[in-house]
Interface confidence: low
């Protein structure tokens, strides 16, 4: 039968490090959209009222409890009248899939903060990225939120060859053995092994020894 004219479809959660946007299609013609998201009491809260956009930032709502399973819906109203209803007395609407931020938000691309060589050891530090999740009026870091569920994988290789080695840590630091006199390149990836979906981030930008981020000490 297809989608009735005016009804939203393809509702999709786009979420990285808890920054969470609900997207849908199509662009509106003779109607506008309003989004509702269910809170922990299963009340529907209105967001993005009367918008002609096809996305709504719901970050402020989902960060209130990242372990909660949220549901949203997109309501369609005739343009210029947000109180008009369909034939059944309700506006046309489409429900989103359920979304649990802690289990489903994508892990953003990590950044290597620094590396320091001392003899044949190199300490590589991953930047602890700030999220939009708040506690006691401060923003929590990715490590604050995920704790030891979050690990990092380090890929490292000699600048002169392509053979990669790996190391893992459930902190934000690696301490690895290197050959003296060799320059190495590094890339890290965030991983949540316990997840079934969205387990890994993209790889960080590559950083190589001999560049500004590094420090060398005998």
């Amino acid at each position: 039968a297809g989608t009735p004219p005016g009804k939203a479809f393809n509702l999709t959660w786009i979420s990285t490090d808890f920054k969470t946007i609900l997207e849908w299609q199509p662009k509106p013609t003779n109607y506008t959209y309003t989004v509702q998201i269910s809170d922990r009491s299963r009340n529907w809260k209105y967001k993005c009222t009367g918008t002609t956009d096809t996305e709504c930032d719901l970050t402020d709502e989902i960060v209130k409890d990242v372990n909660w399973t949220y549901e949203a819906r997109v309501l369609s109203y005739p343009a210029g009248n947000v109180e008009s209803t369909g034939s059944a007395g309700e506006p046309l609407y489409e429900n989103s899939p359920e979304f649990t931020p802690y289990l489903e938000t994508n892990l953003g691309q990590p950044t290597i903060q620094s590396f320091e060589q001392v003899g044949t050891k190199v300490n590589v530090t991953v930047e602890d990225e700030r999220t939009l999740v708040r506690r006691n009026n401060t923003f929590l870091s990715l490590r604050d939120v995920f704790g030891k569920d979050l690990i990092y994988t380090l890929y490292y290789w000699k600048s002169s060859s392509s053979g990669k080695k790996t190391a893992k840590t459930n902190t934000n630091e690696f301490l690895i053995d290197v050959d003296k006199g060799e320059n190495y390149c590094f890339s890290v990836q965030a991983v949540i092994p316990s997840r079934t979906v969205n387990r890994k981030s993209t790889d960080s930008p590559v950083e190589c020894m001999g560049q500004e981020k590094g420090e060398f000490r005998e």
């Epitope: 297809g2 299609q25 662009k27 013609t29 003779n30 002609t52 956009d53 996305e55 005739p78």
Partner: antibody, heavy 124, light 108 residues
């Protein structure tokens, strides 16, 4: 009258990143979508993606992993980046204004203002 | 993805004749999203018709659009020399926004 002026590198090597910018003169970014479209030599038009003045983006899924469109409202311009280019990305790239037009209770969408196009060649 | 198929690929006509260009969508398209563009060699496309039927500013009334659902038509009632070009239909409602493959209107 709104005009779009675009610029960027015209010759790239494979694996490099294409970077183009489109400046809006005689009008505002606000209230419109801003698109990039490309046209390979002798072929038809392909929509790459669009951005709203608020920064909201939509991309063609076939290019999404390589495309970034951004907006700089202070300079009244928007930009396209396409990473890891290959010879298949050789094309004329156009910027365009995608206008939501409200008339008699309905919205219409169309690209009413176009840049002149930038020829981008990818060759080793 | 909504695929737009234009026919014929090439239309060979003389000035003064009537041109009928077809655009068929793989699934229903709201007329609000359907536009037609004209492109001449070395130039950017130019908007002719939006909302399937409405002429853009400055477009002569010999150009008209019609159709709904999956079948749309651009008609040029009497071809002028400057009308020989490539014509594209486009839908701008559902991502990815797509163009038809184009119809070339050439001088016979």
């Amino acid at each position: 009258q709104v005009q779009l002026q675009q610029w960027g590198a015209g010759l790239l090597k494979p694996s490099e990143t294409l970077s183009l910018t489109c400046a809006v003169y005689g009008g505002s970014l606000s209230g419109y979508y801003w698109s990039w479209i490309r046209q390979p030599p002798g072929k038809g038009l392909e929509w790459i993606g669009e951005i709203g003045a608020s920064g909201s983006t939509r991309y063609n899924p076939s290019l999404k992993s390589r495309v970034t469109i951004s907006v700089d409202t202070s300079k009244n311009q928007f930009s396209l980046k396409l990473s890891s280019v290959t010879a298949a990305d050789t094309a004329v790239y156009y910027c365009a204004r995608d206008t939501p037009y409200y008339y008699e209770g309905g919205y219409y969408y169309y690209m009413d203002v176009w840049g002149k196009g930038t020829t981008v060649t990818v060759s080793s | 993805e909504i695929v737009l198929t234009q026919s014929p690929g090439t239309l060979s006509l003389s000035p003064g004749e009537r041109a009928t260009l077809s655009c068929r969508a793989s699934q229903s398209v709201s007329s609000s999203f359907l536009a037609w563009y004209q492109q001449k060699p070395g130039q950017a496309p130019r908007l002719l018709i939006y909302g399937a039927y409405s002429r853009a500013t400055g477009i002569p009334d010999r150009f008209s659009g019609s159709g709904s659902g999956t079948d749309f038509t651009l008609t040029i009632s009497r071809l002028e020399p400057e009308d020989f070009a490539v014509y594209y239909c486009q839908q701008a409602g559902v991502v990815p926004y797509t163009f038809g493959g184009g119809t070339k209107v050439e001088i016979k």
